[in-house]
Amino acid sequence: APVRSLNCTLRDSQQKSLVMSGPYELKALHLQGQDMEQQVVFSMSFVQGEESNDKIPVALGLKEKNLYLSCVLKDDKPTLQLESVDPKNYPKKKMEKRFVFNKIEINNKLEFESAQFPNWYISTSQAENMPVFLGGTKGGQDITDFTMQFVSS
């Protein structure tokens, strides 16, 4: 079945941009001017997920790369990773649960809750140049709010 997708960038609520840090990690840092071109472009897709009033299930791929954000247990802790997929088969409507995030959109702010691990969110640190990670607290030191910007082709 066809999947609705869009291309976008994400910045955390402190306006830090997301960039690649090695082949399988994202980090968050402040960018300006031409450096903004370093930021990752996501292909966000509307996928099948569990029902909830203000949660919309999405998958977050890296545009024109066969990489998707996924949530897995590592050393018994929910962990965010970039996972390689077969580009012939992705994106698809029925994504495996580890790839699914519940997008919560309130007042132009977005949160991305792991469908696999409820109450765990895509997060950034207050500090500069730190990895993007899966965090189990909301409203604490770590940042779970993002803004989205469409990317013009």
């Epitope: 029902e51 910007q149 990317v151």
Partner: antibody, heavy 119, light 108 residues
Framework: EVQLVESGGGLVQPGGSLRLSCTAS????????MAWVRQAPGKGLEWVGI???????YYASWAKGRFTISRDTSKNTVYLQMNSLRAEDTAVYYC?????????????WGQGTLVTVSS | DIVMTQSPSTLSASVGDRVTITCQAS??????LSWYQQKPGKAPKLLIY???TLASGVPSRFSGSGSGAEFTLTISSLQPDDFATYYC??????????FGQGTKLEIK
Amino acid sequence: EVQLVESGGGLVQPGGSLRLSCTASGFSLSSAAMAWVRQAPGKGLEWVGIIYDSASTYYASWAKGRFTISRDTSKNTVYLQMNSLRAEDTAVYYCARERAIFSGDFVLWGQGTLVTVSS
Amino acid sequence: DIVMTQSPSTLSASVGDRVTITCQASQSISSYLSWYQQKPGKAPKLLIYRASTLASGVPSRFSGSGSGAEFTLTISSLQPDDFATYYCQNTGGGINIAFGQGTKLEIK
């Protein structure tokens, strides 16, 4: 004030073209999904299509090929280009903002602009 | 494409009545359904989304229920301002978004 204003409607001959505009105020189109919905006189609502980023547009099956949605973020405006118009395209055309990305429902609507296709 | 069918097409009722409008999808759409109210010469207004969630500012006399392929919109006690045309809409699932044909609620 948050609002949408459509313009560009009018009388056009069959086979002709028309471009409708929808200008947003009070919010930025740089992160808002925008749809076009039409309503023929005395008839129901009919979804035309939706635009996310400029490369991500989706259309009703009947609109593909004849209708094109585009956006100019610098002007905070979305467009509906309509080609090869037919009498059955006569309708009020509304633009509407998606409530949340991929929600598929529309919480903010313009006042509509009437397109009449007739010779 | 998924087809949305509303019933009845026209409904006559009086102020204070409890009224129910039904919407049927040609296949399961889970709870991806919204309801709109439209008055003559005006744009539609979102009432309910995700089958049962009241949109901001909508009076609590409106309620929605259902999932799969059968949905209902209920107005618990009709007010004069409620006489209008109501539309259901399939909001998710695939690429196409589809509206029902509408139900005109008129004064008896």
